[in-house]
């Protein structure tokens, strides 16, 4: 059987929230994105596809002030084929920071989620094909963007879940409903940023599969802030 993933504070993750440098990042991000394209062909191709898709759905989508085409394109690209490689790169950032070719993409996606967040909290479900284990101690976070659904049925579908996997039941306050942006609107997708921290974690196996409840969500300070802004601040905080 596959080795279970540990549910922890994802210490290697790139978790930048761009506090106090959004204006600056908006000026710098397009050039960073071009640099990413030069090093990451998949990102370039997925972005080009997403630009076309975004233009098609843009006028039938509601979005807040300050939300622009590159935020929309990033969301559409994420719901396409980028998520797996992108999330792996985000989660393992500290292991090879020089090979992170999603600098601007991370910014635009993070900013999109921040702009779409309406401060409301919701109960969502996330199914995984891999088993997650919780040590029983301390707070946890995903450390990557995590797709979830408003409906349990979707999370338990074979697209996302297997009996050897885990069903997360999450109370999220930072996650945003991206149904309107998604290539698969019927999934009722809620996108949760990796920096949302859960202080109450309960694991059980009552239904014949592994279930983990994540509650008491909070937005905590990140290890990285404005890292690609030229005025990078990195902190190492003990989140436990």
């Amino acid at each position: 059987l596959a080795v279970p993933f540990m549910l922890d504070m994802a210490p290697n993750a790139f978790d930048d929230q761009y506090e106090s440098c959004v204006e600056d990042m908006e000026k710098k991000a397009p050039q960073l994105l071009q640099e990413d394209f030069n090093m990451n062909e998949e990102l370039k191709l997925e972005w080009e596809k997403a630009e076309i898709n975004w233009k098609e759905i843009k006028n039938s989508t509601s979005y807040p002030a300050g939300f622009h085409d590159f935020h929309g394109t990033a969301l559409v690209a994420y719901t396409g084929n980028l998520a797996i490689d992108f999330n792996r790169a985000v989660r393992d950032f500290k292991k090879s920071p020089d090979n992170f070719h999603y600098k601007a993409f991370h910014y635009y996606l993070t900013r999109a989620v921040q702009l779409l967040n309406d401060q409301g909290c919701s109960l969502v479900y996330r199914g995984t094909k891999v088993m997650f284990e919780y040590t029983g101690k301390g707070s946890v976070r995903f450390g990557q963007f995590s797709s979830s659904s408003l409906t349990k049925r979707v999370a338990l579908s074979s697209n996302f879940f297997s009996n050897h996997g885990t069903l997360f039941i999450i109370r999220t306050c930072l996650g945003v409903n991206i149904k309107e942006f998604s290539s698969f609107p019927r999934e009722e997708e809620v996108l949760i940023p990796g920096y949302e921290v859960y202080h109450k974690v309960t694991a059980q196996n009552d239904n014949g599969y592994n279930e983990i409840f994540l509650d008491s969500p909070e937005r905590k300070k990140s290890n990285f802030n404005c890292f690609y802004n030229g005025s990078a601040q990195t902190v190492n905080i003990d989140f436990s």
């Epitope: 908006e26 000026k27 991000a29 397009p30 071009q34 640099e35 080009e48 622009h68 085409d69």
Partner: nanobody, 122 residues
Amino acid sequence: QVQLQQSGGGLVQAGGSLTLSCRVSGTHFPIRPLAWYRQAPGKERELVASISAGHVTNYNVAVEGRFIISRDNYKDTVYLKMNNVKPEDTAVYLCNLGPATMSTDFRPTDFWGQGTQVTVSS
């Protein structure tokens, strides 16, 4: 609403230099490609140079190595530095704002600057 305000231009001697500026307002500037076009009397409007949102530049072969297009996202301005100008560079120069994209192939929109006359004397 979107506006493009040009400045610079004028009379310059052959071999001399000149810088044109185009300040954009009413849009999120950093994600918009920009270009300079020119139109000489009795000739068709032609693309001189373009710069993508990601700062990738493209030039008309007639100006390559002499002209430099650049952008300043903090000033919402695009520039055209014209070096070693020739009499055949004489024209009205216009800046154009492209649609939001990372594409390096410039596609013009209906957003134009008011035009700037550049006259090169021999």
